[in-house]
């Protein structure tokens, strides 16, 4: 049987709600893109663009998809195998040690300077010293240049402890 | 460590209503099922139904369908219970129980509130 | 739904002394997937229930070894090797192979 909700299934409104697909877990486990019912003796399909399910598992529910913030762009849309993929929009990136927001980019480096690494949507721009070369990660900036974004890695999906 | 600190003991008159709260601190809130039980005066447990913080939805055992509403306040980790149009055979202890997301391990709880007692007398 | 019956339902012991109840299921409670979910609760006097053992052998974190869980099926026994004064209270067993999960009547043990 199929593991996805096809687009059939998804509209018109007018018609009634498909169904969830099933079928039976495999030595207790069901595949991506499913959980296991509250009897344990089916698998049920996530919802394509609501939830997913990214292993085998016997969760009684699917994960929720992940909603891209405002700042962020959508790279790839949540299907019931995989999140969403959401990345920081030109111009801003998000640290590691504060995931939850994405930050602007610094417009230039400090006098004295100089910029050896581009404003991405995971690092702020890199500047070192002119003559010793070392970095720096000083916060206020004087403008002196702009910097772009290029498009980069995606923002791993949240972990259900929250 | 793992706490789940129940409400005190009620009593009520037949028709009325109750909500019970159990606050769960010492793990994440929305990580595990919390599921309700009854105890009736020397009688044995029923498992009456379980929330899931995570997502929103219960799951109800069909005869208390009707007679238990679960809900939860995620700010503030408590789940609660309400049992409305309360008849003489509703007084019993009443006990919050947490389970995991997972059927293999979902079936069983781990930690216990300490018990509500709600006493419905005229 | 599935009964759950214990026996005996009142259980004087010894304290050094072994003892084990009986716990029994209308159906069977092995599930489609091999695993058989019954489960073991201690209600000390006062207290809430306090899992002892799971999925009929696996003692909970922190139990002690003298607690032990064996069986199949529909027959199950949990047998304490050595009672201890503060093993006194009402145990109960419990399925979750079946929806909804359901309890046993509980078995009260206390020191003669």
């Known amino acids: 049987e199929s593991a996805l909700i096809t687009q059939q299934d998804l509209a018109p409104q007018q018609r009634a709600a498909p169904q969830q697909k099933r079928s039976s877990p495999s030595e207790g486990l069901c595949p991506p893109g499913h959980h296991i019912s509250e009897d344990g003796r089916d698998c049920i399909s996530c919802k394509y663009g609501q939830d997913y399910s990214t292993h085998w598992n016997d969760l009684l529910f699917c994960l929720r998809c992940t909603r891209c913030d405002s700042g962020e762009v959508e790279l790839s849309p949540c299907t019931t195998t995989r999140n969403t993929v959401c990345q920081c929009e030109e111009g801003t990136f998000r640290e590691e040690d504060s995931p939850e927001m994405c930050r602007k980019c610094r417009t230039g480096c400090p006098r004295g300077m100089v910029k050896v690494g581009d404003c991405t949507p995971w690092s702020d721009i890199e500047c070192v010293h002119k003559e010793s070369g070392t970095k720096h990660s000083g916060e206020v900036p004087a403008v002196e240049e702009t910097v772009t974004s290029s498009p980069g890695t995606p923002a791993s999906p949240c972990s259900l402890s929250g | 460590q793992v706490q789940l600190v129940q409400s005190g003991a009620e009593v009520k008159k037949p028709g009325a209503s109750v909500k019970v709260s159990c606050k769960a601190s010492?793990?994440?809130?929305?990580?595990?099922?919390m599921n309700w039980m009854k105890q009736s005066p020397g009688k044995s447990l029923e498992w009456i139904g379980r929330?899931?913080?995570?997502?929103?939805?219960?799951f109800y055992n069909q005869k208390f369908k009707g007679k238990a509403t679960l809900t939860v306040d995620k700010s503030t980790s408590t789940a609660y219970m309400e049992l409305s149009s309360l008849r003489s055979e509703d007084t019993a202890v009443y006990f919050c129980g947490r389970s995991a997301y997972y059927f293999d391990s979902g079936g069983y709880f781990d930690y216990w509130g300490q018990g509500t007692l709600v006493t419905v007398s005229s | 739904d599935i009964v759950m019956t214990q026996s005996p339902l009142s259980l004087p012991v010894t304290p050094g002394e072994p003892a084990s109840i009986s716990c029994r299921s209308s159906q069977s409670l092995v599930h489609s997937n091999g695993n058989t979910y019954l489960h073991w609760y201690l209600q000390k006097p006062g207290q809430s229930p306090q899992l002892l053992i799971y999925?009929?052998?696996n003692r909970f974190s922190g139990v002690p070894d003298r607690f032990s869980g064996s069986g199949s099926g529909t027959d199950f026994t949990l047998k304490i090797s050595r009672v201890e004064a503060e093993d006194v209270g009402v145990y109960y067993c419990s399925q979750s192979t079946h929806v909804p999960w359901t309890f046993g009547p509980g078995t009260k043990v206390e020191i003669k």
């Open positions: 010492g793990y994440s809130f929305i990580g595990y099922f």
């Open positions: 929330f899931n913080p995570y997502n929103g939805d219960t």
């Open positions: 999925k009929v052998s």
